[in-house]
């Protein structure tokens, strides 16, 4: 069967360029997802951000993220969702485990799980940011 | 050993549509991205779109949008291209190509498969 | 888009001269950057991915560099075999856009 090569070696910085992008994605979906009136955030629902166990960029839960947000694109037609997911893929090894999402059926539950997984998805992508500008910081101190 | 095998050479008429297929063996990862590139004689590499075959998921040029639809059959291994309305500028090699890794997004494209040459003639 | 602007589209050189190709970037592609050859009658084949690593396989004289949203594919001895056409193309975000390809001949 056929074997990975070596895992490439980035520099931090453009890894870092990634989660800004992503960062900057995630809020053009926030906002898009906002505009829609009277819906509440849910506390049923949990999007995987940050793995303790792991350093930076390894770190964030990007398979259960993008499968999350394949889920959105699928409850609801937001383009920014493709850009996101094909950044989501640089940070996603080829052996990385498929993550299974329940999707809601109801109509309003629906439109809970969108906004509150894109507000955990931008909160998500600051904390990243934030895990990989430390983690930097402390390399180089 | 990876290997990408396209089907054989096609003649169409202006109008019709064409299923361009890429089987590809020795690989076992679903989470990659396989894109599809042709070239007109003498010119150089167009891409035409892309494909993630553990989901079907597509990206398409905007030039093609709309004409070409590609698919992907994780069973056999096998993605298809199908392009339609054809017209004289679209003879040309149709390529399929996908990259080793070690991420699911490409960084370049590493196994290329021998090309399908499609002639649009009336 | 992101358009591809690659440089020269055609050039002469003799062999064991130094040969440089560029691509420039619509905007910045983070070293997404992918450089191949392709031979007359022949399948593209990927020389450079990532900018600057070398594929499998790929003769040392080969390298690549980036300085901004330009980046270069350089041959640092032109040898008679290395007669072809070569691309750059990009991977930030789709579309993956194709330069426009260089075609390099021997004097």
């Known amino acids: 069967s056929h074997t990975l090569p070596v895992r490439l070696l980035r520099p931090s910085d453009d890894v870092q360029k990634i989660v800004e992008e992503l960062q900057s994605l995630s809020k053009m979906l926030l906002k898009d997802v906002e505009e829609e009136k009277g819906v509440l955030v849910s506390q049923n629902y949990t999007l995987p951000c940050l793995s303790p166990d792991a350093q930076p960029p390894n770190n964030i839960h990007s398979p259960a993220i993008r499968a999350y947000l394949k889920t959105i694109r699928q409850l609801d037609n937001k383009s920014v969702i493709d850009e996101i997911i094909e950044h989501l893929d640089k940070l996603i090894f080829q052996d990385a485990p498929e993550t299974n999402i329940s999707v809601p059926t109801d109509t309003h539950e629906c439109k809970r799980f969108i906004l509150t997984i894109s507000q955990q998805f931008s909160e998500c992508m600051d904390l990243a940011l934030k895990s990989l500008t430390s983690g930097a910081q402390q390399a180089t101190t | 050993q990876v290997q990408l095998v396209q089907s054989g050479a096609e003649v169409k008429k202006p109008g019709s549509s064409v299923k361009v297929s890429c089987k590809a063996s020795g690989y076992t990862r679903t989470r990659y991205w396989m894109q599809w590139v042709r070239q007109a004689p003498g010119q150089g590499l167009e891409w035409m779109g892309a494909i993630y075959p553990g989901e079907g998921d597509t990206r398409y040029s905007q030039k093609f949008k709309g004409r070409v639809t590609i698919t992907a059959d994780k069973s056999t291994s096998t993605a298809y291209m199908e392009l339609s309305s054809l017209r004289s500028e679209d003879t040309a090699v149709y390529y399929c190509a996908f990259p080793e890794g070690p991420y699911a997004a490409p960084y370049g494209m590493h196994y290329w498969g021998q090309g399908t040459t499609v002639t649009v003639s009336s | 888009a992101i358009q591809m602007t690659q440089s020269p589209s055609s050039l002469s050189a003799s062999v064991g001269d130094r040969v440089t190709i560029t691509c420039r970037a619509s905007?910045?592609?983070?070293?997404?950057l992918a450089w191949y050859q392709q031979k007359p009658g022949k399948v593209p084949k990927l020389l450079i991915y990532?900018?600057?690593t070398s594929a499998s396989g790929v003769p040392s004289r080969f390298s690549g560099s980036r300085s901004g949203t330009d980046y270069t594919l350089t041959i640092s001895s032109l040898q008679p075999e290395d007669v072809a056409t070569y691309y750059c193309q990009h991977f930030w975000k789709t579309p993956w856009t194709f330069g426009g390809g260089t075609k390099v001949e021997i004097k």
């Open positions: 905007r910045n592609i983070h070293n997404y």
């Open positions: 990532y900018a600057k």
